[in-house]
């Protein structure tokens, strides 16, 4: 089997963690988040060729069926395998609060 | 906010559970699985428009950034939210065994 982390499409083309710089306005948060003003958003972007970072058996099945029926079954997709928490200072009905979100920033990626 | 389960693209076009009939050959399992001979594979297929079955905050962010930077950030992707287990009768080095796989069949879907 091919090395699950070796991208056959060339460096940086396959599913991996990317960082996108975004303002509160970009994120659609300007009306409810006070801080931070900008976020380095980590997200999973890239192609999922055969055997590359397959998350599980389902991803293997999906790839095999995609090769057979590409118009019916899409290729596996690059999504977060886990997340890093982030704390936001946000407006609430009663004032301002500090809130931790556990599902905001991707920590690492795989293909599903 | 739009109902998270109402597809704005028309019935059946958005992220949902599909069933694909597959043989052991289709799945690439013919050399190690004895039974079943065929599988009704449940998988997640369909588009992920804004606010449709968003898995978490990360999916919301991804959609907002996709709208801003469609060439850089892909739209959220339709993937399993949970799985149904399946038991396979498989060949092993020492003979034949019954093995349960927890990550084989999608149970329900969301957008990440």
């Amino acid at each position: 089997a091919r090395n699950g982390d070796r991208c056959p499409l060339g460096p940086g083309r396959c599913c991996r963690l990317h960082t996108v710089h975004a303002s509160l306005e970009d994120l659609g948060w300007a009306d409810w988040v006070l801080s931070p003003r900008e976020v380095q958003v980590t997200m999973c972007i890239g192609a999922c060729p055969s055997q590359f970072r397959e998350a599980n058996m389902h991803a293997q099945i999906k790839m095999n069926l995609h090769r057979l029926k590409p118009d019916t079954v899409p290729a596996p997709c690059c999504v977060p395998a886990s997340y890093n928490p982030m704390v936001l200072i946000q407006k609430t009905d009663t004032g301002v609060s500090l809130q931790t979100y556990d599902d905001l920033l991707a920590k690492d990626c795989h293909c599903v | 906010a739009r109902n998270g389960d109402r597809c704005p693209l028309g019935p059946g076009r958005c992220c949902r559970l599909h069933t694909v009939h597959a043989s052991l050959e289709d799945l690439g399992w013919a050399d190690w699985v004895l039974s079943p001979r065929e599988v009704q594979v449940t998988m997640c297929i369909g588009a992920c428009p804004s606010q449709f079955r968003e898995a978490n905050m990360h999916a919301q962010i991804k959609m907002n950034l996709h709208r801003l930077k469609p060439d850089t950030v892909p739209a959220p992707c339709c993937v399993p939210a949970s799985y149904n287990p399946m038991v396979l009768i498989q060949k092993t080095d020492t003979g034949v065994s019954l093995q349960t796989y927890d990550d084989l069949l999608a149970k329900d879907c969301h957008c990440v």
């Epitope: 006070l34 801080s35 931070p36 003003r37 976020v39 380095q40 980590t42 890093n84 928490p85 982030m86 704390v87 200072i89 407006k91 301002v96 609060s97 500090l98 809130q99 931790t100 920033l105 | -």
Partner: antibody
Amino acid sequence: QVQLVQSGAEVKKPGASVKVSCKASGYTFASYDIIWVRQAPGQGLEWMGWISALSGDTVYAQKLQGRVTMTTDTSTSTAYMELRSLRSDDTAVYYCARTRHDTSGIRFDYWGQGTLVTVSS
Amino acid sequence: DIQMTQSPSSVSASVGDRVTITCRASQGIDSWLAWYQQKPGKAPKLLIYAASSLQSGVPSRFSGSGSGTDFTLTISSLQPEDFATYYCQQVHSFPITFGGGTKVEIK
């Protein structure tokens, strides 16, 4: 370089008010929020509150609610903390600090030199 | 409010010693904890943030660890300039709270 320079020491009578200033330089003032912390003689650090340098939104410590007001003036890059109805147990060194907030969380990376407020009759 | 309990309240140590200070939160605070050093008559100085990240310019002999409720600040080899009081601080929820402080004294 980043600097927070506070106003000078004050001596006040019980019942009076005090207003401490904190002038920032070396960075874009509105991009970083401010907290105020105080320290009574020989005691530990006590968080007083937080203010958004951009919007002016505030959060105050419950025990100071109704007596404290934090404000900012972006035109002069200055934060202010006013404490009213002073009591002897308000005698402390008052610090302002810059809030750094990013994906690694919140921390207070630059501090003013402190302002001693003495409340005595 | 989240209570932060530091121990010990004071420790006597010699130059070159390894010093460990612990901080316990009354409820889980993820990794949202910072450590500060304060010398007499001076403002606090940030050492560690996000439980284990070293602030720029702080010597590598300082390190932090922990998550949830239990945290540790370690000075691997105590230097003369490290004699000071150390405070932990949670930034998980308002009100932000500090530990009571640990004074590191010369033995």
